[in-house]
Amino acid sequence: CPGACVCYNEPKVTTSCPQQGLQAVPVGIPAASQRIFLHGNRISHVPAASFRACRNLTILWLHSNVLARIDAAAFTGLALLEQLDLSDNAQLRSVDPATFHGLGRLHTLHLDRCGLQELGPGLFRGLAALQYLYLQDNALQALPDDTFRDLGNLTHLFLHGNRISSVPERAFRGLHSLDRLLLHQNRVAHVHPHAFRDLGRLMTLYLFANNLSALPTEALAPLRALQYLRLNDNPWVCDCRARPLWAWLQKFRGSSSEVPCSLPQRLAGRDLKRLAANDLQGC
């Protein structure tokens, strides 16, 4: 067992070295380790094959370090890995698209608060078992087409607190099992009418605190399972173009937030849902 760590075998073989001031991944981690806790240290780099000997590893926590670089092959050999937490590493900024390849059993991936500016092509390729993906509180500006295409079992996708300005047509392709999509506190001004086409199982959608002045109801039509919708804190324009959204909200049987109008001035602060159809005039 490495000097700064505690190692124990029941109920799972665990190597636990949190908050020890470590500046590198310690050598001598027992090969039988099923869980490795390295969070809260000063580790800045995860070299290739850092954990290759740990074939039985199911949980790896590296959150709250100062990671600036993760070699593309850092997690090779970890075919049984189920949880990987890399959050709270603000200097990371980018992740090589090959980093997570081969992690076919991964069900939870934390990449929140990592200063990520983009999601490279194929970053999540092959992660068929992934259920929870935490990408909130980064600096993401765009959602490239087909980024999540392989994530057919993903149920929770957290993208809030980024700088995303639009939701393109193919952003969420393949997310047939998605239950919860959090997109609040971004800069979304435009949602493509077909952006949510694959989200037939979505129950919760948060779009509050964005830059939306309108939302095509065509985008909401596929959301047959939707129960919770939050649209507040957007600059909604409540003129005749808002009529389709108004009509959709009247029929919506789930729970929705207020939709306060910004314009026209005479309706500023009023809730779109509570307006009458003939209030929505002038274009």
Epitope: V6, Y8, T14, S16, F37, Y132, H156, F158
Partner: antibody, heavy 122, light 109 residues
């Protein structure tokens, strides 16, 4: 400052269920977790489980697995704890508490509800 | 209970008292320790978090420390209003849950 207000005392029959609510005011649910702790008369504190409302995920103590369900309604900032198949040993004060941050594992419970007395008696 | 505390402790006003909390490698050995104070008939209150940090409003007479698989709470300049039950707590990796200590009843003589 966040305040947690719980529902009132309950008297239940063995075998039945109880659902206790915990309404948060002064803050939104989006930046913290809610946990439930119970205390039988004259006994110590016992953790039952917790929920991170914004993530929609709950954790339960092994002892209560299958018997407790913790949920949250973000639209009303209210968390719920339902305990089923009640027995006399479940007679206790049930507390909800706020967890600093979004990791139950690093949990410190910095604000507590006033407690709800649940009595299980035939 | 996975964390063991002495059932009782006592001291006179102005004295310093220490309450111990003994655990194992899967809880205190691997995770941070918190301490809670429960005055008679009230809900618990967070006293110390992350081994040795005090929330705002908690007097600096209260301090916490951790070494290996044990932790302790020290109260200096004991006051009559410190009479309460004190609980240590930590996450347990083996149980995948939060565990409390057995509790210590502090009496100010």
């Amino acid at each position: 400052e966040v305040q947690l207000v719980q529902s009132g005392a309950e008297v239940k029959k063995p075998g039945s269920s109880v659902k206790v609510s915990c309404k948060a005011s002064g803050d939104t649910f989006s930046s913290y977790a809610i946990t439930w702790v119970r205390q039988a008369p004259g006994q110590g504190l016992e953790w039952m489980g917790g929920i991170i409302p914004i993530y929609g995920t709950a954790n339960y103590a092994q002892k209560f697995q299958g018997r407790v369900t913790i949920t949250a309604d973000e639209s009303t900032n209210t968390a719920y704890m339902k305990l089923s198949s009640l027995r006399s040993e479940d007679t206790a004060v049930y507390y909800c508490a706020r967890v600093v941050g979004l990791r139950l594992r690093d949990a410190a419970f910095d604000a507590w509800g006033q407690g709800t007395m649940v009595t299980v008696s035939s | 209970y996975v964390l063991t505390q002495p059932p009782s402790a006592s001291g006179t006003p102005g004295q310093r008292v220490t309450i111990s909390c003994s655990g194992s490698s899967s809880n205190i050995g691997s995770n941070t320790v918190n301490w809670y104070q429960q005055l008679p008939g009230t809900a618990p209150k967070l006293l110390i978090y992350s081994n040795n940090q005090r929330p705002s409003g908690v007097p600096d007479r209260f301090s916490g420390s951790k070494s290996g698989t044990s932790a302790s709470l020290a109260i200096s300049g004991l006051q009559s209003e410190d009479e309460a039950d004190y609980y240590c707590a930590a996450w347990d990796d083996s149980l995948n849950g939060y565990v409390f200590g057995t509790g210590t009843k502090l009496t100010v003589l």
